[in-house]
């Protein structure tokens, strides 16, 4: 007996052969012997089967003894044997339909789960071999799931559904809801203006949900929320802002805030939630300011840092075009009695300067002027 | 009987592009996935990428910025371009099917080795 | 990238030996591992995928096992014409394959 598979949806074309290469009398029945389609002369005639409306065959193939029985729309409960009788002889043809779905919305937010649910014929014994679109296999019997969606398995997703050394073919597009990076640094030196900006990494048609930055300054205990916000089809409209600092946000995607002036107060990190309406769950994106201040009081120059700086970060000062005269793995660094020139103060990471301030120290009977 | 042939110049000047195609008999290249493996002379065997029956693409990361593999399904053959090309690059190129998804290339091309050089 | 490791990676035997060939992966490869069989001037040809199926046509004195991160290739006797180089590859995430063993005649 051959077996066919199908796919849920598509079309199917069962072969039936003559040995006369003419049109004769034909009839594909199913296994309860129920007429679905035959000819009579050159006219197609249909039984009463369940297939009536989506049965079909190709007359143009009748005159060279080829009768095949096409079946539109396929459904799972269509799987089934097939005989065609022609000639005196039974021709028969196993059909399997299988159909594979993700089990909810094709649009997860990152670290959800990914469920494939195969479709299948009882007493068929199918294994799923899928593949992500950054090229990682994983096989399953009726489900297959992966866990900790991330922004890498946005894609198609290609499945191969194996049945008796046969197989068929599936493709899914999955759409991984995420900011484009998980988490951002912006170094400014006090007083100048910062920027946020939270792009995301897919584009839908309508986008509408709501959002808060939460911000936990290094000085402060605890931490607090700076701003909330609605979106509506990617239309952004600010609900409440905290009076320190004063946010201002940008009307349009992707999400963009922009802080008045870094001062070592707001120096610390902070954490923008979106959540999108009709999802579970919330997208998350981290933040971290860094502020440098640097100052001569009396005989002393200093250079701060505030906000989250790794371990390896260097902080240094040093003289125009001189070799740093300190340097060191702190938050801070001073000069006793510095001499009177341009002095920068540095902050690095592994030799690439991420945050510079300069600082004019005077001959000692004068005031600093900073530029 | 399935059967893949690979053909393009064998030989190709330093910064070139090579490009490659391998024509598919006994199969269509709608179905599977169609990969490019290539083996440098007296060594081992490299994974460069391959096209799928969804017509997308994945390729080796070391060479992901040289590598772009594309279809014609009309006349059932794909192709490889490999950018840039140095003397590291000169190797047995060869196209194999892997039917089922498992990467487990089940039809090779008898391969067609590529030399780079001035 | 999972990194495959061969061993040995040459070894002698005579028709009729049994011979064992195994393959280490730098990471779990959840079953992905495929063997191939090469000769000199030719492509590979597949013997084993997905740890132990057998290729169709492929005799069944080659035989896979394994799991895990440890897998291996055995040739239950030795013909003349299994004499070549043997390599394994990974199909968990993006191909890597081991650096070959070398079946020679004693």
């Known amino acids: 007996k051959k077996v066919v598979l199908g796919k849920k949806g598509d079309t199917v074309e069962l072969t039936c052969t003559a040995s006369q290469k003419k049109s004769i009398q034909f009839h594909w029945k199913n296994s309860n012997q129920i007429k679905i389609l035959g000819n009579q002369g050159s006219f197609l005639t249909k039984g009463p089967s369940k297939l009536n409306d989506r049965a079909d065959s190709r007359r143009s193939l009748w005159d060279q003894g080829n009768f095949p029985l096409i079946i539109k729309n396929l459904k799972i409960e269509d799987s089934d044997t097939y005989i065609c009788e022609v000639e005196d002889q039974k021709e028969e043809v196993q059909l399997l339909v299988f159909g594979l779905t993700a089990n909810s919305d094709t649009h997860l937010l990152q670290g959800q789960s990914l469920t494939l649910t195969l479709e299948s014929p009882p007493g068929s014994s199918p294994s799923v071999q899928c593949r992500s679109p950054r090229g990682k296999n994983i096989q399953g019997g009726k489900t297959l799931s992966v866990s900790q969606l991330e922004l890498q398995d946005s894609g198609t997703w290609t499945c191969t559904v194996l049945q008796n050394q046969k197989k068929v073919e599936f493709k899914i597009d999955i759409v991984v809801l995420a900011f484009q990076k998980a988490s951002s640094i912006v170094y400014k030196k006090e007083g100048e203006q910062v920027e946020f900006s939270f792009p995301l990494a897919f584009t839908v048609e309508k986008l509408t949900g709501s959002g808060e930055l939460w911000w936990q300054a290094e000085r402060a205990s605890s931490s607090k929320s700076w701003i909330t916000f609605d979106l509506k089809n990617k239309e952004v409209s600010v609900k409440r802002v905290t009076q320190d600092p004063k946010l201002q946000m940008g009307k349009k995607l992707p999400l963009h805030l922009t802080l008045p002036q870094a001062l070592p107060q707001y120096a610390g990190s902070g954490n923008l939630t979106l959540a999108l309406e009709a999802k579970t769950g919330k997208l998350h994106q981290e933040v971290n300011l860094v502020v440098m201040r640097a100052t001569q009081l009396q005989k002393n120059l200093t250079c701060e840092v505030w906000g989250p700086t790794s371990p390896k970060l260097m902080l240094s000062l040093k003289l125009e075009n001189k070799e740093a005269k300190v340097s060191k793995r702190e938050k801070a660094v001073w000069v006793l009695n510095p001499e009177a020139g341009m002095w920068q103060c540095l902050l690095s990471d592994s030799g690439q300067v991420l945050l510079e301030s300069n600082i004019k120290v005077l001959p000692t009977w004068s005031t600093p002027v900073q530029p | 009987q399935v059967q893949l042939q690979e053909s393009g110049p064998g030989l190709v000047k330093p910064s070139e592009t090579l490009s490659l195609t391998c024509t598919v008999s006994?199969?269509?290249?709608?179905?599977?996935?169609w990969n490019w493996i290539r083996q440098p002379p007296g060594k081992g065997l490299e994974f460069l990428g391959y096209?799928?029956?969804?017509?997308?693409?994945n390729y080796n990361p070391s060479l992901k910025s040289r590598v772009t593999i594309s279809r014609d399904t009309s006349k059932n053959q794909f192709s490889l371009k490999l950018s840039s090309v140095t003397a590291a690059d000169t190797a047995v190129y060869y196209c194999?099917?892997?039917?089922?998804?498992?990467?487990?290339?089940?039809?090779w091309g008898q391969g067609t080795l590529v030399t780079v050089s001035s | 990238d999972i990194q495959l490791t061969q061993s040995p990676s040459s070894l002698s035997a005579s028709v009729g030996d049994r011979v064992t060939i195994t393959c280490r992966a730098s990471?779990?490869?959840?079953?992905?591992l495929n063997w191939y069989q090469q000769k000199p001037g030719k492509a590979p040809k597949l013997l084993i995928y997905y740890t132990s199926r057998l290729h169709s046509g492929v005799p069944s004195r080659f035989s896979g096992s394994g799991s895990g991160t440890d897998y291996t290739l055995t040739i239950s006797s030795l013909q003349p014409e299994d004499f070549a180089t043997y390599y394994c590859q990974q199909g968990n995430t993006l191909p890597t394959f081991g650096q070959g063993t070398k079946l020679e005649i004693k």
């Open positions: 194999a099917r892997d039917d089922y998804g498992y990467y487990a290339m089940d039809y």
């Open positions: 096209i799928s029956f969804a017509d997308t693409t």
């Open positions: 990471q779990d490869i959840d079953n992905y």
């Open positions: 006994g199969d269509s290249i709608t179905s599977g996935y």
